[in-house]
Interface confidence: medium
């Protein structure tokens, strides 16, 4: 909604003419004091809609708020409106005239209220007085609304000075009403139902004896009324409930069910709403997916969680390599499915102290008569690396051959390193990495095998040292995401008798 000129407040000269335009992407109209003044509404050549309000020969009586609203405002669209305020200073008019019922102000509890005496000129100074005592009260004044504050049960008048004459407003009477605050709660037996099932909604009020229930629900639109049942639940505090029951739900019963509770002695009220969805058939839907490969660490516990939405309650089965799983008596495997909200579920598979044999393909299947869903993943069990052997051999050609064998999951990396100064190795001197050197001093060959039955990799790395001219400390280190392991061996030249 776009208002031109934009405002939000205008001060007009008496007898002048003022044009206000409101434009939007849907038909609009102007409202003043809930009345619709004469205006020109049109669709423009650019496809927008506008309404032009022309105020001619304005007087003090034109002072007030004007709203631009959508002209078929129903339901929540009512709140979508734009306000501007116009002052027309009129020395002949003191306070704006009031309807007699607006002079009686009913207050419940200690709440802020407004004594709505308004003037046509925003420059005027206005004071509030208790009628009996002619002393101004220190209450903030808003020229567009009046005096805003907390008032006792007394009689009040507003005063202002126009030129050299003092002007009094009508008398305002403030009355306090004791009504306990309304506390409404609305709940449904189920907010998701299949067609043919029943809808039951309860609206409960605490601590008030005289209340009026008013329901709005989707069936009202087609003129089919449902008779609610009022239920008195005696006790301390007292509770009154209204129950709306639809025995056989239809798809058109989907929507918002609103319970409006009002107290007849005042305008006190509260409103609560709940959404109900009627579905043709039940459903099961995954809310989160899992990576295709899930990792567990050997001898650690691992919980795998699947979140899904379903109605009605589904059965849940877990499978490993196409065989159904169940809670094990040894407590190595725990299955649980929790209902975390009306239609949301969390199914968990917990593997306690994971074993290598628990690696494999897992599937969770959630199903009922109307629908089913399944989620599969591969469980990989990670095993720390171990160097199983580091051996050396001396073929006749004078080479030294070192063979390092180890296992782990995921696949380990092999690093060979050497250290020549035995006294300072490896604490004080960093080892030198070895590999296939261009000088052909060393040659490295690594073979990897995956052992299906053990679900882990075996690495065999062979290091050929062409000639060794002094004692060397050689280390083979295996490393993967689970950690590292190493072994060392001391290699001596063929010609050198070496004692450790």
């Amino acid at each position: 909604l776009v208002i031109t000129p934009p405002g939000p407040e205008f001060v007009l000269n008496i007898s002048s003419t003022f044009v206000l335009t409101c434009s939007s992407s849907a038909p609009v109209m102007w409202e003043q004091m809930s009345q619709v003044p004469w205006q020109e509404a049109a669709m423009n050549q650019d496809g927008t809609f506008s309404s032009v309000l022309t105020l001619t020969n304005v007087t003090g009586g034109d002072t007030g708020e004007y709203f631009c609203v959508y002209n078929n405002s129903l339901g929540p669209e009512l709140s979508e409106r734009k306000r501007i305020y116009i002052f027309v200073p009129d020395p002949t008019m003191g306070f704006l005239p009031m309807d007699s019922e607006d002079l009686f102000i009913f207050v419940t509890d200690v709440t802020e209220t407004t004594i709505p005496c308004r003037v046509t000129d925003p420059q005027l100074e206005v004071t509030l007085h208790e009628k009996k005592v002619d002393i101004p009260l220190h209450v903030p004044y808003d020229h567009q609304r009046g005096f805003i504050g907390t008032f006792e049960d007394k009689t009040y008048i507003c005063k202002t000075t126009i030129g050299d004459r003092e002007v009094d407003s009508d008398t305002y009477y403030v009355y306090s009403l004791q009504v306990s605050s309304i506390n409404v709660s609305v709940n449904a037996v189920q907010t998701v139902v299949r067609q043919g099932e029943s809808i039951t909604i309860r609206c409960i009020v605490m601590g008030n004896d005289v209340v009026n229930f008013q329901w709005t629900y989707p069936r009202m639109k087609s003129g089919r009324l449902v008779e609610p049942v009022t239920d008195y639940l005696f006790g301390v505090p007292s509770r009154i409930g209204s129950i709306l029951h639809i025995p056989t739900a239809e798809l058109s019963d989907s929507g918002t069910y609103t319970c409006n509770v009002s107290v007849s002695v005042n305008d006190h009220g509260d409103e609560k709403a709940i959404n109900v969805t009627v579905i043709e058939n039940g459903y099961v839907r995954l809310l989160e997916t899992l990576e295709d490969v899930q990792i567990a660490e050997l001898h650690r516990s691992r919980t795998l969680q699947v979140v899904f939405e379903a109605y009605p309650t589904p059965s849940v089965l877990w499978f490993k390599d196409n065989r159904t799983l169940g809670d094990s008596s040894a407590g190595e495997l725990v299955l649980s499915t929790r209902n975390v909200s009306e239609t949301r579920y969390v199914s968990e598979l917990t593997l306690v102290r994971v074993k290598v044999s628990e690696a494999g393909y897992y599937t969770m299947r959630a199903f009922h008569a109307d629908d089913q869903v399944q989620l599969s993943f591969k469980l990989q069990v990670n095993v720390p690396v171990r160097v199983l052997e580091l051996s050396e051999s001396h073929p006749a050609n004078g080479e030294q051959i070192l063979r390092c064998r180890g296992r782990g999951m995921p696949q380990p990396n092999v690093t060979w390193s050497t250290c020549r100064d035995l006294k300072r190795c490896p604490r004080k001197l960093s080892p030198t990495p070895l590999g296939n050197s261009s000088k052909e001093e060393s040659q490295l060959e690594t073979n990897v095998t995956f052992w299906e039955e053990d679900q882990e990799y075996e690495v065999v790395s062979t290091l050929r040292l062409r000639h060794v001219d002094q004692p060397l400390s050689v280390r083979c280190m295996l490393q993967n995401s689970m950690g590292r392991d190493s072994q060392e061996v001391t290699v001596v030249p063929h010609s050198l008798p070496f004692k450790v």
């Epitope: 776009v2 992407s25 849907a26 038909p27 496809g47 927008t48 809609f49 078929n72 669209e77």
Partner: nanobody, 118 residues
């Protein structure tokens, strides 16, 4: 961001019919006011028909009774059924979208040519 794609234009004889379609991307289609506009050679672009987010449909007087605009929120689409076409209906027809609460059309299609020969 809304993308609009028109289709259904072409060349027809006076008195024939054509149906234009416009499909929008985006999940909040129902909250937009949608409009059909046209621009004849050498003239300004003018509105033909509008369907608002709160479900008013308004047609320009010159096409009333001959053109019917409709909308299908489930398909994110609007349509313009053009019957009893006249040579003066020859123009590029554009589909446009205006967000709720604004007073302008921020999103436009590329246009589709309609030619009516006598």
């Amino acid at each position: 961001e809304v993308q609009l794609v028109e289709s259904g234009g072409g060349t027809v004889q006076a008195g024939d019919s054509l149906r234009l379609s416009c499909t929008a991307s985006g999940r909040t289609f129902s909250t937009y006011t949608m409009g059909w506009f046209r621009q004849a050679p050498g003239k300004e672009r003018v509105v033909v028909a509008v369907n608002t987010w709160n479900n008013f449909t308004v047609h320009q007087p010159s096409v009333k009774g001959r053109f019917t605009m409709s909308r299908d929120n489930t398909k994110n689409s609007i349509y313009l059924q053009m019957d009893s076409l006249k040579p003066e209906d020859t123009a590029v027809y554009y589909c446009a979208a205006s967000a709720k609460g604004t007073a302008r059309y921020d999103y436009w299609g590329q246009g589709t040519q309609v030619t009516v020969s006598s």
